[in-house]
Interface confidence: low
């Protein structure tokens, strides 16, 4: 006589801030009506009431008003619980009790997760490094859950396990910030990578830093520029770093410094005959005259535009000659996407809708991802177009065609691949049949 209540064996994984469905079902017997149904969801351990349905009516949420049943599906034996805006504190076991004439129950586990941010890397000390120096590299990643696994490796992919200290601290929402410190003795040069893994999401966030210790001058002037592109936001100022090692007795009168566009050889800025010859590039460049004598030949580029993107070569001539090229990568963040729906009213399950996600004035071209409320990627029936305006900034429009279920959340994520900046919007469509009492 016991009623068979079915729940998933595996934990339900839900991202913090999203909605989760805790599935629970039973088989209604002939003649079953909702008036006969008593349904209780409670926390398995504490027995705290979460949500109930009794006397033919949804008794509502007893859990911070963040739960809902699927009232139009109850009559078909679907006792699932929708938990909205999942928090870390929600993690645990929920028991679904169903009573009609007979009684049954089963427990389902909720596993909460949050992706870790792209790690930021810092170096201490961060200048005048020589082979043999000991440096401390810190890798920091934020707002993830559960606790992360952190891996370090060198440029060849060899794991670095010695001298690693990792700490993880939970904030008031229960999300973890992870800080991992690697102490390493520098070789001639080296790349050090930090990988932060979310064990539940199997999501890896990684960053790396390349350290090239300075070597002593050998005849030619050694001109040093950053290996990685300089990333500059449209409209801001960028510094293209370039340095050389002055010999004893060096004076600015001996210096010839030329900045030019690597590809076209167009002159950008120059310093010759002991004088700053000024900008040849739309009057938007400047040197750091007070620092030139110390070997700092860096160039300041003001009010960066998309058209500035590319390679700049720094030529330094004293008695000897040297040069190096630095890349400028221009970027502009995408706006928070606006979501439009067509049609946008009288939507019903089974209807085909067109959801348009629009984000504006970003650079470079975006990557667009769609996913449903469970975080499952939606790849079919997506058309994305990107159009550059006269400033070279892109407006992105991505169109998803989807057939509605009873209800659903559709999220659009517009990623700036250079800034690793994600802008996202979502739309929740509820088109379920009427049931009493109201819950929507």
């Amino acid at each position: 006589g016991a009623l068979e209540v079915q729940v998933p064996e595996d934990p339900v994984v839900a991202l913090v801030g999203t909605d989760a469905t805790l599935c629970c079902s039973f088989s209604p017997e002939p003649g079953f009506s909702l008036a006969q149904l008593n349904l209780i969801w409670q926390l398995t351990d504490t027995k705290q009431l979460v949500h109930s349905f009794a006397e033919g009516q949804d008794q509502g949420s007893a859990y911070a008003n963040r739960t809902a049943l699927f009232p139009d599906l109850l009559a078909q034996g679907n006792a699932s619980l929708r938990l909205q805006r999942v928090r870390v504190a929600d993690e645990g076991s929920f028991t679904c009790f169903v009573s009609i004439r007979d009684f049954g129950s089963a427990a389902v586990s909720l596993q909460v997760a949050a992706p870790y941010s792209k790690p930021s890397m810092t170096l201490e000390p961060n200048k005048d490094l020589r082979p043999g120096d000991t440096v401390t590299i810190t890798c920091s990643s934020y707002q993830g859950y559960p606790e992360a696994e952190v891996f370090w490796q060198d440029g060849q992919g060899v794991p670095l396990t010695g001298n690693v200290t990792t700490s993880q601290m939970a904030n008031e929402q229960g999300l973890f910030d992870v800080h991992s410190i690697l102490r390493v003795v520098l070789g001639a040069n080296g790349t050090y990578s930090c990988l932060v893994r979310n064990p539940v999401l199997q999501q890896d966030a990684h960053s790396s830093v390349t350290i090239t210790p300075q070597r002593s001058p050998t005849g030619a002037v050694e001109v040093q520029v950053p290996e990685d592109p300089v990333v500059a936001l449209v409209g801001t100022d960028a510094t293209l770093r370039c340095s050389f090692s002055p010999e004893p007795g060096f004076s600015l009168a001996q210096l010839n410094l030329i900045w030019q566009l690597t590809d076209t050889k167009q002159l950008v800025h120059s310093f010759t005959e002991g004088r700053d010859q000024g900008s040849a590039y739309a009057n938007r460049t400047a040197l750091f005259p007070d620092l030139l004598a110390q070997g700092n030949a860096s160039l300041r580029l003001q009010r960066v535009r998309v058209a500035d993107e590319g390679s700049f070569t720094c030529f330094v001539s004293i008695r000897d000659f040297g040069s190096a090229a630095v890349s400028l990568q221009v970027a502009a963040p995408y706006s928070k996407p606006s979501m439009t729906l067509e049609p946008n009213k009288d939507l019903r399950p089974g209807d085909t809708v067109t959801i348009t996600c629009s984000s504006y004035r970003g650079y470079p071209e975006a990557e667009v991802f769609w996913q449903d409320g469970q975080g499952v990627p939606l790849t079919g029936n997506v058309t994305t177009s990107q159009m550059a305006n006269e400033q070279g900034l892109f407006d992105v429009h991505s169109v998803l065609r989807v057939v509605l279920g009873a209800n659903g959340t559709y999220s659009c994520l517009v990623r700036n691949p250079v800034l690793q900046q994600d802008a996202h919007g979502s739309v929740t469509i509820t088109g379920q049949p009427m049931t009493f009492p109201p819950e929507a």
């Epitope: 008794q59 509502g60 109201p438």
Partner: antibody, heavy 119, light 112 residues
């Protein structure tokens, strides 16, 4: 466009039965519930209950339990109201009205069916 | 059951003048989800009722903006800023917070 078309007027004797139909068009019938509302002559509106068109489960207001039956034929997108053992006080206009699906209102109504019970 | 009481019973109005109808419920109409399911319907002479306002203050599609709804808890009001001849009929308030859904007794708006 959404339409609810009800069957024509009925004149019945006390003790007889009547079956009123409500044919829906212009939307997916099984996506939204249907309500039944009674209006006695010169009186206001009374909500009789509703039927879940997805599963066929009816819900009746207390005063309409027993002699009143809501049913469906989803193959022809039609809902029915059957009243048995008719009494003089059942004389009224009976309306079917669609749930809007979001706000717990009745957004589209049939034109009404007049049922007159008289000996 | 929730009792809905409307006043006045009859409301004669001159075209172009404003009109106001009151509706009071015997219990609060705030649902446990914090939403208030109070609606207004108009039944024009010889016609079926039609939805005017849903959830206290939201005009249904096609309803002129001279109609507005307000209120909270147990006291609600429907206002017509400038009555027109086509506005005549019986106005009903209705609640769907509690089952069974119930209607007010109606207010008959007439043109003077």
């Amino acid at each position: 466009q959404v339409q609810l078309v009800q069957s024509g007027s009925e004149l019945k004797k006390p003790g007889a039965s009547v079956k009123v139909s409500c044919k829906a068009s212009g939307y997916t019938f099984t996506n939204l519930g249907l309500n039944w509302v009674r209006q006695a002559p010169g009186q206001g509106l009374e909500w009789m209950g509703w039927i879940n068109t997805a599963g066929g489960q009816p819900t009746y207001a207390e005063d309409f339990k027993g002699r009143f039956v809501f049913s469906l034929d989803t193959s022809v997108s039609t809902a029915y109201l059957q009243i048995s053992s008719l009494k003089a006080e059942d004389t009224a206009v009976y309306y079917c009205a669609r749930d809007d699906g979001y706000y717990y209102t009745m957004d589209y109504w049939g034109q009404g069916t007049t049922v007159t019970v008289s000996s | 059951d929730i009792v809905m009481t409307q006043s006045p019973l009859s409301l004669p109005v001159t075209p172009g003048e404003p009109a106001s109808i009151s509706c009071r419920s015997s219990q609060s109409l705030v649902h446990s989800n914090a939403k208030t399911y109070l609606h207004w319907y108009l039944q024009k002479p010889g016609q079926s009722p039609q939805l005017l306002i849903y959830k206290v203050s939201n005009r249904f599609s096609g309803v002129p903006d001279r109609f507005s709804g307000s209120g909270s808890g147990t006291d609600f009001t429907l206002k017509i800023s400038r009555v027109e001849a086509e506005d005549v009929g019986v106005y009903y308030c209705s609640q769907s917070t509690h089952v069974p859904w119930t209607f007010g007794g109606g207010t008959k708006l007439e043109i003077k």
